[in-house]
């Protein structure tokens, strides 16, 4: 049994890092491999992470994390049984994916203005709290040409848009992901869609 | 919110024992350090030493190496800094401080007064 | 006593800027990120920068903090009164053994 690709780790500076990688052949991951990591820290404990199937050799793991700070570094140990298939180390600041944004949702009680609002997936005492700006995709379920993305650079996780830039009497689906320049994370994924139905008054022309 | 509550002012003699108590509130107990630090009147802040109130190791500053011991309760979120064999120089305020790398909170300290 | 030398006081009018410096080694601020902690008068420590740059939220912009090398600096901006305190950096040590120094303080006056 070897390891094909080495495991990559990415974490949502929060509670949770994700390990991926790939044997040189068909795994039960979950029986035959374990992944141990252990924070380089006085007095830190080793955990281990059952890995969980990702496709037939492929393996996942989420590893548990108290605490993140920029400091922090892991060492990663894959074992099957008492063999040690390979041995690394996780900087869990160098390689930051957001957790997705939640709570879409499209106010158009505004008159001829949509609101769309979103929650930040971070607490306050989360360094990325304040430091995360957003794109909001925004498209058409009619015309599939129809497709925009507004860049959201403020704090506040909300976007205010004309309803007259999008079609009358058509319906729309918005989603928003998120990112942090000061750790040069990835995007998040995406967060649920929410869908609504656009209308609006004509301007009544002279 | 984060709140550290701390035991009250004691006055010992030279040669006994104190010890002092951290209560903590407003997050997960056993997910983040404790350390103490002390700071004698008109003088700078000391670090003690250090609790993992998951497991309970523990790690001293090499000058109280053999006088102190950090304990925990995991039961009321407690944690507790015995200092023995007292002398006149540890009168001083005792604190305790949530954190790993740097100290996000602290308690509001505790006065240890060692006088014969 | 510590292995971090800040000066023992420093002084500028409200407005001002003022800055206070903290040198270590190279085994602690050289291999490691840097903390502030403002002491108000007869006050608990109040982390003010961690990271050696980055402010915990509710701490106003007004204070920043940078490394270079072996030592640290801790700026602030547009001060006001209730900036009169006692300043400390802090950082850890891993080398002989894990410890956490503390600057030796030092006492801002708003004149």
């Known amino acids: 049994m070897k390891v094909l690709q080495e495991p990559t780790c990415v974490s949502d500076y929060m509670s949770i890092s994700t390990c991926e990688w790939k044997m040189n052949g068909p795994t039960n991951c979950s029986t035959e491999l374990r992944l141990l990591y252990q924070l380089v820290f006085l007095l830190s404990e080793a955990h281990t992470c059952i890995p969980e199937n990702n496709g037939g050799a492929g393996c996942v793991c989420h590893l548990l994390m108290d605490d993140v700070v920029s400091a922090d570094n892991y060492t990663l140990d894959l074992w099957a049984g008492q063999q040690l298939l390979w041995k690394g180390s996780f900087k869990p600041s160098e390689h930051v994916k957001p957790r997705a944004p939640g709570n879409l949702t499209v106010h158009t009680n505004v008159s001829d203005t949509l609101l769309l609002t979103w929650s930040n997936p971070y607490p306050p005492d989360n360094y990325l709290y304040n430091h995360l700006t957003y794109a909001v995709n925004i498209w058409s379920e009619n015309d599939p040409a129809d497709f925009r993305i507004y860049n959201v650079t403020y704090l506040e996780p909300s976007l205010r848009i004309a309803a007259s830039t999008l079609k009358s009497g058509i319906s729309y689906r918005a989603r928003v992901r998120a990112w942090a320049q000061c750790y040069n994370t990835t995007w998040s994924e995406w967060s649920p869609s929410t869908k609504w139905h656009n209308s609006y008054r004509e301007p009544f022309e002279q | 919110q984060v709140q550290l509550v701390q035991s009250g002012a004691e006055v010992k003699k030279p040669g006994a024992s104190v010890k002092v108590s951290c209560k903590a509130s407003?997050?997960?107990?056993?997910?983040?350090?404790m350390h103490w630090a002390r700071q004698a009147p008109g003088q700078g802040l000391e670090w003690m030493g250090i609790i993992n109130p998951s497991g309970g190791s523990t790690s001293y500053a090499q000058k109280f190496q053999g006088r102190v011991t950090m304990t925990r309760d995991t039961s009321t979120s407690t944690v507790y800094m015995e200092l023995s064999s007292l002398r006149s120089e540890d009168t001083a305020v005792y604190y305790c401080?949530?954190?790993?790398?740097?100290?996000?909170?602290w308690g509001k300290g505790t006065r240890v007064t060692v006088s014969s | 006593q510590s292995v971090l030398t800040q000066p023992p006081s420093v002084s500028a009018a409200p407005g001002q800027k003022v800055t206070i410096s903290c040198s270590g080694g190279?085994?602690?601020?050289?291999?490691?990120?840097v903390s502030w902690y403002q002491q108000l008068p007869g006050t608990a420590p109040k982390l003010l920068i961690y990271?050696?740059?980055k402010r915990p939220s509710g701490i106003p912009d007004r204070f920043s903090g940078s490394k270079s090398g072996t030592s640290a600096t801790l700026a602030i901006t547009g001060l006001q009164t209730g900036d009169e305190a006692d300043y400390y950096c802090g950082t850890w040590d891993t080398s002989p053994v894990w410890e956490w120094p503390f600057g030796t303080g030092t006492k801002l006056t708003v004149l």
């Open positions: 190279s085994s602690n601020i050289g291999n490691s990120y």
């Open positions: 407003g997050y997960a107990f056993t997910s983040y350090y």
């Open positions: 990271d050696n740059n």
């Open positions: 401080a949530r954190g790993k790398y740097w100290m996000y909170d």
